[in-house]
Amino acid sequence: MMTGTIETTGNISAEKGGSIILQCHLSSTTAQVTQVNWEQQDQLLAICNADLGWHISPSFKDRVAPGPGLGLTLQSLTVNDTGEYFCIYHTYPDGTYTGRIFLEVLESSVAEHGARFQIP
């Protein structure tokens, strides 16, 4: 039985040109995390393998950095980065847990007047 839950940063906003950390945390399970995949819509951004480390997609090499921890840092944000991001935890023996984060990238002037979304 899958007992775990994923806590995420939820809905977040960031300024165009800036960077943002996407974070997920798996709790309430003793399952072993074997790999975490980070995805945006239908694109695989990065993989963190528990034994082997990080690999970043060659198409995002310039704008994605691993960490902190199992999180992911997106850099040089553009408005096109707005959308859903998923952290997919592959665990043994539970199986797969998925967390969702919605990122809105705002024009600088909008961001200065306060983000529409708050990190819970």
Epitope: L44, N49, L52, P58, S59
Partner: antibody, heavy 119, light 107 residues
Framework: EVKLVESGGALVQPGGSLKLSCAAS????????MYWVRQTPEKRLEWVAS????????YYPDTLKGRFTISRDNAKNTLYLQMSRLKSEDTDMYYC????????????WGQGTSVTVSS | DIVMTQSHKFMSTSVGDRVTITCKAS??????VAWYQQKPGQSPKLLIY???ARHTGVPDRFTGSGSGTDFTLTISNVQSEDLADYFC?????????FGVGTKLELK
């Protein structure tokens, strides 16, 4: 069992067009990135194109951009490669391949389909 | 573009021997390197990914190692069915690039 079966290879004249297909079975096609890779008669391997799971993004080497187009139909479990303005140097064996779920690497390849560009 | 150099186009070996195939990247690719085996008339088959991880079903006589720019594929206790072409590939950066291959043949 993962199975990838390419088709559509043919003898075509320089300047002509050709569309290759790759029928996938034995896995959930829409969950995987897919690739086309070609191999010259001298056995040199060259990456041709990549496509994301839903087909929203495609990638090509600069040398092939504009002439080749990768696409997919997830309802039909089929990958395509549209090739235009073909040149003699496009004469190759064309393979489709699946990206691994563990890494950005091609874990299963089809048997290939042969393309010959000659007048 | 990242050039993957396999300096030995041919390597001779005997059944039971240990052989090491090398591959050098023109720039740092971390551990984003795969090794493929291709037998005559067949398509390439993945052996190693992440520089050292064995693909499902690959015998443990195949071992990959290296990081940065220098990579090796070692086959210990070579079997006759291992006689094939071996290609390295980097997937750290686009365009994805392959080595020219090393043909493993009997002495």
């Amino acid at each position: 069992e993962v199975k990838l079966v390419e088709s559509g290879g043919a003898l075509v004249q320089p300047g002509g067009s050709l569309k290759l297909s790759c029928a996938a079975s034995g896995f959930t096609f829409s969950d995987y990135y897919m690739y086309w890779v070609r191999q010259t008669p001298e056995k040199r391997l060259e990456w041709v194109a990549s496509i994301t799971k839903g087909g929203g993004s495609t990638y090509y080497p600069d040398t092939l951009k504009g002439r080749f187009t990768i696409s997919r139909d997830n309802a039909k479990n089929t990958l395509y490669l549209q090739m235009s303005r073909l040149k003699s140097e496009d004469t190759d064996m064309y393979y489709c391949a699946r990206q691994s779920s563990y890494d950005f690497v091609m874990d299963y390849w089809g048997q290939g389909t042969s393309v010959t560009v000659s007048s | 573009d990242i050039v993957m150099t396999q300096s030995h186009k041919f390597m001779s070996t005997s059944v039971g021997d240990r052989v090491t195939i090398t591959c050098k990247a023109s720039q740092d690719v971390d551990t984003a390197v795969a090794w493929y085996q291709q037998k005559p008339g067949q398509s390439p088959k993945l052996l190693i990914y992440w520089a050292s991880a064995r693909h499902t079903g690959v015998p443990d006589r195949f071992t990959g190692s290296g990081s940065g720019t220098d990579f090796t594929l070692t086959i210990s206790n070579v079997q006759s069915e291992d006689l094939a072409d071996y290609f390295c590939q980097q997937y750290s950066n686009y365009p994805l690039t392959f080595g020219v291959g090393t043909k493993l043949e009997l002495k």
